[in-house]
């Protein structure tokens, strides 16, 4: 059994999250993950899910009663999601920590927008993306 | 030329982001994107970048002078990043909108944690992930 399982059960008790009523009104993450089989699609969704958990854990960082559980779960998330790669984890953390209300950050983001957009689609690197793919307003 | 380019230039003027000094102290996104060649790694990072831009645009949704530019860029992001798939975009939006301070959301997140963790590594679905792969604490 992976180390996180016991610690996640401990968190369930702490958050009173073991009761069946918690599942009322649908799931947060599991239903969404079920929709996506392609690895790159799953990473798009899991990236948001992992950042949610990191934020949640940060909010409880001063609660000593769950520190060991949180650390063990983060350890295993880093193994599983970041493939034990500190640079990947650090780059991810940098992105999640940028403040959207910081004027300098806003200016930089807009300054980089064209180049970011040019890299967004997988085929962008090979220049193969067709105009016929373009149908969406959102 | 993709439609977003002209509109991004318009945003550069609005945010006063065209000056060379904006690039001082390094990049926000471009340096990080340069580190990752694997498609699944890129999606992890781009997921955070796209959610940043969506939040930024949301903050300026009442500013009529840039509405057309913002809408055009969002449209093109949806084409490029979500491959014109509304369900993918909607699931993504759901994940970005969950409040980490909402007690019901916290309970649900902890309730789902074990299953989310079990799905995090690519090999988890095929049951091939070996114990020997596991090393990381974060």
């Amino acid at each position: 059994q992976d180390p996180y399982v016991k610690e996640a059960e401990n968190l369930k008790k702490y958050f009173n999250a073991g009761h069946s009523d918690v599942a009322d009104n649908g799931t947060l993450f599991l239903g969404i993950l079920k929709n996506w089989k392609e690895e790159s699609d799953r990473k798009i969704m899991q990236s948001q899910i992992v950042s949610f958990y990191f934020k949640l854990f940060k909010n409880f960082k001063d609660d000593q009663s769950i520190q060991k559980s949180v650390e063990t779960i983060k350890e295993d998330m880093n193994v599983k999601f970041f493939n034990s790669n500190k640079k990947k984890r650090d780059d991810f953390e940098k992105l999640t920590n940028y403040s959207v209300t910081d004027l300098n950050v806003q200016r930089k983001a807009i300054h980089e927008l064209i180049q970011v957009m040019a890299e967004l689609s997988p085929a962008a690197k090979t220049g193969k993306r067709k105009r016929s793919q373009m149908l969406f307003r959102g | 030329q993709d439609p977003y380019v002209k509109e991004a230039e318009n945003l550069k003027k609005y945010f006063n982001a065209g000056h060379s000094d904006v690039a001082d102290n390094g990049t926000l996104f471009l340096g990080i994107l340069k580190n990752w060649k694997e498609e699944s790694d890129r999606k992890i990072m781009q997921s955070q970048i796209v959610s940043f831009y969506f939040k930024l645009f949301k903050n300026f949704k009442d500013d009529q002078s840039i509405q057309k530019s913002v809408e055009t860029i969002k449209e093109d992001m949806n084409v490029k990043f979500f491959n014109s798939n509304k369900k993918k975009r909607d699931d993504f939006e759901k994940l970005t909108n969950y409040s980490v301070t909402d007690l019901n959301v916290q309970r649900k997140a902890i309730h789902e944690l074990i299953q989310v963790m079990a799905e995090l590594s690519p090999a988890a679905k095929t049951g091939k992930r070996k114990r020997s792969q596991m090393l990381f604490r974060g």
Partner: antibody, heavy 120, light 110 residues
């Protein structure tokens, strides 16, 4: 100050076993990953194995997989390497190293090493 | 498998600058941090650069690290070379399932 002291090296015959220990002090042992690195006489550094702070996650070089086992006892601040089915090519100085944070990354502090000689 | 390649040896006069390269093969060097270690004769290695460019406290500013994505290589730069810089230098990184060392570079101060 971080201190790492390896012990348990010595002369062993091919096919034999040895257990190396590394006593750690000067830091919160359970918060850091630990590694074993070896260096054959006159050769470069070769990473052998690593273990996470909790001990729940282990990692091995292909050359030792299935023969060596890394473990730790956080209550004793001690790291171990159980070496079985030893071969002549395992002859080396074995260093215990503390990771610079709690993951596979950079080896911030090293012990002075213990010599393992595999010979008949 | 990802590999790190270093020159076997470099030599230079005191006061000069030496650059030791560490080239990634079969993978992207920028996708993991690169570290550098110094090993003097009959001593254990010591960390001198971590996370591509960072220096641990106590390491002189004469030593610096860099990454060049275009050549897929990392470099250790030792400026104002001194006799005490004579040692073996190893680059190190990791991939998804192991830690990797380069073969080492012997620096001789002429």
């Amino acid at each position: 100050e971080v201190q790492l002291l390896e012990s348990g090296g010595g002369l062993v015959q091919p096919g034999g076993s040895l257990r190396l220990s590394c006593a750690a002090s000067g830091f919160t042992f359970s918060s850091y990953a630990m590694s074993w690195v070896r260096q054959a006489p006159g050769k470069g550094l070769e990473w052998v194995s690593a273990i996470s702070g909790s001990g729940g996650s282990t990692y091995y070089a292909d050359s030792v997989k299935g023969r060596f086992t890394i473990s730790r006892d956080n209550s004793k601040n001690t790291l171990y390497l159980q070496m079985n089915s030893l071969r002549a090519e395992d002859t080396a100085v074995y260093y215990c190293a503390k990771d610079g944070w709690n993951a596979l990354g950079w080896l911030e502090s090293w012990g002075q090493g213990t010599m393992v000689t595999v010979s008949s | 498998n990802f590999m790190l390649t270093q020159p076997h040896a470099v030599s230079e006069s005191p006061g000069k600058t030496v650059t030791i390269s560490c080239t990634g093969r079969n993978g992207n060097i920028a996708s993991n941090y690169v570290q550098w270690y110094q090993q003097r004769p009959d001593s254990a290695p010591t960390l001198i650069i971590f996370e591509d460019t960072q220096r641990p406290s106590g390491v002189p500013t004469r030593l610096s690290g860099s990454i060049d994505t275009s050549s897929n290589s990392a470099s250790l730069i030792i400026s104002s070379l001194r006799t005490e810089d004579e040692a073996d230098y190893y680059c190190q990184s990791s991939d998804s399932n192991r830690v990797l060392f380069g073969g080492g570079t012997k620096v001789t101060v002429l």
